[in-house]
């Protein structure tokens, strides 16, 4: 049966026993800046082109054992959430991956900047259709990272990022705090903000909307047919990247402002239990859970 | 995210180092009264001192970025400091990434075309 997260973002008309928009997102390229990925996993084979871009810091600790499946875990799962055959949102989207996070899931602002520059140069050398850039990472507030995101957004690229898993104001983190970026918080099957250990999803006025981000089934790098459940604002951002890819595939001329407006318009409103957020943040945090447009757009989204 | 907000740095640390002398005989002295700023991550464990992104003013060309980077290296060498230019940015932002001692920040902030300098910091999978 359909995983809860795909059911949650699917318009009621399509909530049969399966989620299958046959060619969602086929005109769009989604760039993923993350860990290395297992690109021949059954769920994503042929859908992800691994670029030769790699800019990662060395792993911490003298006894660190580099295990390929662990190195690929985060990125493989997210690639599956965006475009996986069976558990993906935009099953028709093609992806390109850049490695900016090491085997411990750690990267640098500078490496991310160089990655964003690589995308811009690729766009200039070989202009394609609409581009979505997924940044499932967060660091402290960074003027330069936000500036780079702003420039890329002004070049017509849609950037989607994780709000952060620090149970804190997203405005204190980058690229979450960049105004031009679509910043995504995480909710669970009960439409509650996601708790992650002692922390949880970030919140506040720098968040644009929320999306499913707890117990999300996706490709596991443990084996070529394995699936695993992962949680976090990265998973939530991957849902929105997939939805954005489908919207842009249906309407390639959408501007960033129009896309953002559509994401908000089609979101489920006022379903999140705001009591989870600090009192002073409740009014600032958008009560929106991302969803695909309803069946009135059948010809566009489910052709 | 969330358009329509004013720029707010939160806990972000901004260390403004005012330009003082016009030493080293810079061919292109910075415009009078402009102040290049230094930024670093407010979360101390995430800081990566020793690597800096030098961001140049918006209209700076690649050749000027390269020249500015070389000038920094030359001036640092005269003071006995080794520096390494790790990357020259162009396409999104003009600037360069440099590995150097924090002792050279004041010098770097006085270079022509410099808008601000940011210490590198960590980002994490979410």
């Amino acid at each position: 049966s359909i995983p809860w997260n795909l059911e949650r973002i699917t318009p009621p008309r399509y909530r049969a026993d399966e989620y299958q928009p046959p060619d969602g997102g086929s005109l769009v390229e989604v760039y993923l800046l993350d860990t290395s990925i297992q690109s021949d996993h059954r769920e994503i084979e042929g859908r992800v082109m691994v670029t030769d871009f790699e800019n990662v810091p060395e792993e911490d600790g003298t006894r660190f054992h580099r295990q390929a499946s662990k190195c690929d875990s985060h990125g493989t799962h997210l690639a599956g959430v965006v475009s996986g055959r069976d558990a993906g949102v935009a099953k028709g989207a093609s992806m390109r991956s850049l490695r900016v996070l090491n085997c411990q899931g750690k990267g640098t602002v500078s490496g991310t900047l160089i990655g964003l520059e690589f995308i811009r140069k690729s766009q200039l050398v070989q202009p394609v259709g609409p581009l979505v850039v997924l940044l499932p990472l967060a660091g402290g507030y960074s003027r330069v990272l936000n500036a780079a995101c702003q420039r890329l957004a002004r070049a017509g690229v849609v950037l989607v990022t994780a709000a952060g898993n620090f149970r804190d104001d997203a405005c204190l983190y980058s690229p979450a705090s960049a105004p031009e970026v679509i910043t995504v918080g995480a909710t669970n099957a009960q439409d509650q903000p996601v708790t992650l250990g002692t922390l949880g999803t970030n919140f506040g006025r720098c968040v644009d909307l929320f999306a499913p981000g707890e117990d999300i089934i996706g490709a596991s790098s443990d084996c070529s047919t394995c699936f695993v459940s992962q949680s976090g604002t990265s998973q939530a951002a991957a849902h929105v990247a997939g939805i954005a890819a489908m919207m842009l595939s249906a309407e390639p001329e959408l501007t960033l402002a129009e896309l953002r407006q559509r994401l908000i318009h089609f979101s489920a409103k006022d379903v999140i239990n705001e009591a989870w957020f600090p009192e002073d943040q409740r009014v600032l945090t958008p009560n929106l859970v991302a969803a695909l447009p309803p069946s009135t757009h059948e010809n566009l989204y489910f052709q | 995210g969330a358009m329509g907000q004013e720029d707010e740095d939160g806990d972000y640390e901004e260390l403004v180092l005012a330009l003082r002398s016009e030493e080293d005989g810079l061919a292109e002295a910075p415009e009078h009264g402009t102040t290049a700023t230094f930024h670093r991550c407010a979360k101390d464990p995430w800081r990566l001192p020793g690597t800096y992104v030098v961001v140049l003013k918006e209209e700076t060309h690649l050749s000027q970025s390269e020249r500015t980077a070389r000038r920094l290296q030359a001036q640092a060498a005269r003071r006995g400091y080794l520096t390494k230019i790790l990357h020259v940015f162009h396409g999104l932002l003009p600037g360069f990434l440099v590995k150097m001692s924090g002792d050279l920040l004041e010098l770097a902030l006085k270079l022509p075309h410099v808008d601000y300098i940011e210490e590198d910091s960590s980002v994490f999978a979410q």
């Epitope: 059954r42 084979e45 691994v50 069976d86 070529s224 047919t225 | -």
Partner: antibody, heavy 115, light 109 residues
Framework: QIQLVQSGAEVKKPGASVKVSCKAS????????ISWVRQAPGQGLEWMGW????????NYAQKVQGRVTMTTDTSTSTVYMELRSLRSDDTAVYFC????????WGQGTTVTVSS | QSALTQPASVSGSPGQSITISCTGT?????????VSWYQQHPGKPPKLMIY???NRPSGVSNRFSGSKSGNTASLTISGLQAEDEADYFC?????????FGGGTKLAVL
């Protein structure tokens, strides 16, 4: 263009081993593994397993597990499928195909097991 | 004994439409979006005609279409032509492997 080129026909005695090769070209190898499928004379298709060009991981069908070994040589973009302890019912045409989706196929290698 | 059940043979006249069924379980056809259909002419390797239930690879005629309902997938060929005479195999993912149907011999009368 995308191609999978297999080695030539083999005749083997029962109990022997056979090693069939499949050279891939024309696409990004690490984006797909290679599946092996066999077809006994006049019969249907049987999936034997899969190997990754990316990390060499394998996934074997239960029926041949223990008798089959799949390997890659990334320097020559070639995949090998070795089947041991051959029996007469292993007589078949052996195909390599691209990925689990099997969207591109090799021309096939006839393996005859006969005493 | 194949994991997926297909009719052994079907036939049709030129110009007609025929449908070949492929029945599995919730652990294969019913549980995955990845049902494929292959055409095989004698002495040739199989050729992918439909992937992921209903998608056609480029170069495959739009006379071929696929669908799925529950645990049964179907291949429909409209406007039958002489060159469509061949064996047709369905395949599906399972949790850890791949399974094929026993094959259907299509005769164009």
């Amino acid at each position: 263009q995308i191609q999978l080129v297999q080695s030539g026909a083999e005749v083997k005695k029962p109990g022997a081993s056979v090693k069939v090769s499949c050279k891939a070209s024309g696409y990004t190898l690490t984006s797909y593994g290679i599946s092996w499928v066999r077809q006994a004379p006049g019969q249907g298709l049987e999936w034997m397993g899969w190997i990754s060009f990316y990390n060499g991981n394998t996934n074997y069908a239960q029926k041949v597990q223990g008798r089959v070994t799949m390997t890659t040589d990334t320097s020559t973009s070639t995949v090998y499928m070795e089947l041991r302890s051959l029996r007469s019912d292993d007589t078949a045409v052996y195909f390599c195909a691209r990925g689990y989706g099997m969207d591109v196929w090799g021309q096939g290698t006839t393996v005859t097991v006969s005493s | 004994q194949s994991a997926l059940t297909q009719p052994a043979s079907v036939s049709g006249s030129p110009g007609q439409s025929i449908t070949i069924s492929c029945t599995g379980t919730s652990s294969d056809v019913g549980g995955y979006n990845s049902v494929s259909w292959y055409q095989q002419h004698p002495g040739k390797p199989p050729k992918l005609m439909i992937y992921e239930v209903s998608n056609r690879p480029s170069g495959v005629s739009n006379r071929f279409s696929g669908s799925k309902s529950g645990n049964t997938a179907s291949l429909t060929i409209s406007g039958l032509q002489a060159e469509d005479e061949a064996d047709y195999f369905c395949s599906s993912y399972t949790s850890t492997s791949m399974v094929f149907g026993g094959g259907t011999k299509l005769a164009v009368l």
